[in-house]
Structures are given as C-alpha cells and as structure tokens.
Interface confidence: medium
Amino acid sequence: MMTGTIETTGNISAKKGGSVILQCHLSSTMAQVTQVNWEQHDHSLLAIRNAELGWHIYPAFKDRVAPGPGLGLTLQSLTMNDTGEYFCTYHTYPDGTYRGRIFLEVLESSVAEHSARFQIP
C-alpha cells in the first residue's frame, strides 16, 4: 500500500537568464528511494539520480542543469521556453512510483520575484 506523499515547490516563477531550484520531497513512507527522475512536460528526461550510481544529467541539458540540492535540480540560464510543467518521479521499493508536479513560469521582467513554497499537489 502506498502511504507516501510528494511535496513540491508548486507553482514558481523566475526571471529570464536567472536560475531556479526544482525541489520535491517524499514523506509519510518508509519506502526506499531507489531512483528519482526529473522530466519536462513532454516526457523528456532532464536528469536521473540513482541511489546506487549517483547523478546523470542528459546530454541535451548538460550546460544548463546542475544536480541538487539533495534530490532536487537546479535550472540555469533560464529562457522563456523553459516555462511549463516539470515532474519529479520517485521510484521507491517496495511502494512503487510517486510523482510530483511543478509549474515554472519564466518572466521577462527584471523585477520578477522568485516565489517558491512547498505544497502538496
């Protein structure tokens, strides 16, 4: 039985050219996290953090994605095209898969305030 819940940074905004941290947290379960996948809305993989093997950043994103903090992901040099949904998929044993959603809005404005709060989607 899957008892866990994913908390995410929810809806966040950041300015063009800046960076943003995508963060998910799995709670309320004793399941072992074996892998975390970070994906874009089109299912393309940005990065994998495997418990045995560490981080792998996919080649298309190597220049603009940094692993961490923790199991999170840092997107750098943001462009307007980065606006959209991001998903963290927690592969756990024995529970199975937990999935969290984050919506990132990249703003042109230089006064765009980086807003992030943890929430349960």
Partner: antibody, heavy 125, light 107 residues
C-alpha cells in the same frame, strides 16, 4: 561483451528449495553499473520478473514472490544466485538471468539488454 | 504494481506487410518502456528502450512510439525472421512488469 550462463538442477521436488547460479563472463560484476536480474517464463506463458540485485548487494524482489526469494551476488566468482523456497508445480518454468543496463552510459533503469539462454526447472516428485 | 496490457494477443500478417502492436500501462510510465522479441526456444532479445530508441543492431524497420500509458511497436515491412512473440515491459518502478505478449504469425 558480457555473457551470461545459468546453471543448476533441472528437477526440484515440491516443498524444496530451487537454487540457480548465473555466471557472468566478459566483464567484472564488481565494476559494473548495472542490475543483475532473474526472470522466469512458465511453459507457454509470458515473462515474470523475479528480482534484481546491484553489485553492492541491494536487492529488489517481486512482491508476489518476495517471501520465498533470495538473490545474492558473489563478486569474487563473478556470479549471482537465486534461491526460491517451498516450490510447487507452479514454479515450473524456464529461468533466465539477465542484466539491466549493461550497454548504457545513461545509467538508471533502462531495459534487460543481455540475457542468458535460460535453464528449464521442473518441480515434480 | 503497474499492469501492462498488450493487444492483440495474436496478429496474423503477410510477409512484407506492416504490423502494429499495442501496449497499455495501468498508470503513466513516462517513456520508460522496452520492447522485446522472443522466438521459440530462445531468450528474449531487446528491440527498443526508452519507448522509441532502437537497441544496438536492431533493423530500422522496427520503431517504437508513445509515452505515458499508450505505446506502439511498428514493424514496417515484416520479414520471415520477424514472426515471433513480442513483449513490452515497463522499466519505471519496482516491480518490473511485462505485458502478456503479442504473437505475430504468418497469415
């Protein structure tokens, strides 16, 4: 290129323990960034994942078999093993050892890309 | 666990024709899906991983598509050696699960 070879008795009595070994050649388990797995196929049926192990000894089992399964790895012999206890006729199958992610630099969960040829195990008195 | 359902169970096709095999996951597996080919008396062979990437040495007539819960394996022009059973498998969470298989037979 890694190659796999299963070995073990072809006949096991009901209630006994099935024991199989998979020998890996062409590369060292101790340095491999992949998962070692056991998969079975009952006669005329589909494939069923039994469980997987990483070189560190971390194991992952199919919940339907977990209470009866033990998978272990011996890096010094370049082998990994399957033990399935309290077998019944329903455990009669071709048992395959396989490697998940052997040919991928993009590590993580990918696919079973290398398979042994399989060994038939019959449970009968 | 994620249940993988394949259809049809049997597909009768003439050599040279196109074959389309379907696989459905009971919940999203993103692009974490593999396809295998198995011939009688042989171990399965990996054809496609990450839903659409051909494994090394697999001919271009094999192609995979789909993401989320719906996936397709297409064999553009069936050769005699392609008549076999095809399995899909999700590579996303534990436990690993396979579909029941589609047998592609000669019409």
């Amino acid at each position: 290129q890694l190659q796999l070879q299963e070995s073990g008795p072809g006949l096991v009595k009901p209630s006994e323990t099935l024991s199989l070994t998979c020998t890996v050649s062409g590369g060292s388990i101790s340095s491999g960034s992949y998962y070692l797995a056991w998969i079975r196929q009952p006669p005329g049926k589909g494939l069923e994942w039994i469980g997987s192990i990483f070189r560190s000894g971390s194991t992952y089992y199919n919940p339907s078999l977990e209470s009866r399964v033990t998978i272990s790895v011996d890096t010094s012999k370049n082998q990994f093993s399957l033990k399935l206890s309290s077998v019944t006729a329903a455990d009669t199958a071709v048992y395959y050892c396989a490697i998940e992610g052997a040919n991928f630099k993009d590590f993580g969960y990918v696919a079973f890309d290398i398979w042994g040829q399989g060994t038939t195990v019959t449970v009968s008195s | 666990e994620i249940v993988m359902t394949q259809s049809p169970a049997t597909l009768s096709v003439s050599p040279g024709e196109r074959a389309t095999l379907s696989c459905r996951a009971s919940k999203s597996v993103s692009s974490n899906l593999a396809w295998y080919q198995q011939k009688p008396g042989q171990a399965p062979r990996l054809l496609i991983y990450f839903a659409s990437t051909r494994a090394t040495g697999i001919p271009a007539r094999f192609s995979g598509s789909g993401s989320g819960t719906e996936f397709t394996l297409t064999i553009s022009s069936l050769q005699s050696e392609d008549f076999a059973v095809y399995y899909c498998q999700q590579t996303s969470p534990w436990p690993r699960t396979f579909g029941g298989g589609t047998k592609v037979e000669i019409k």
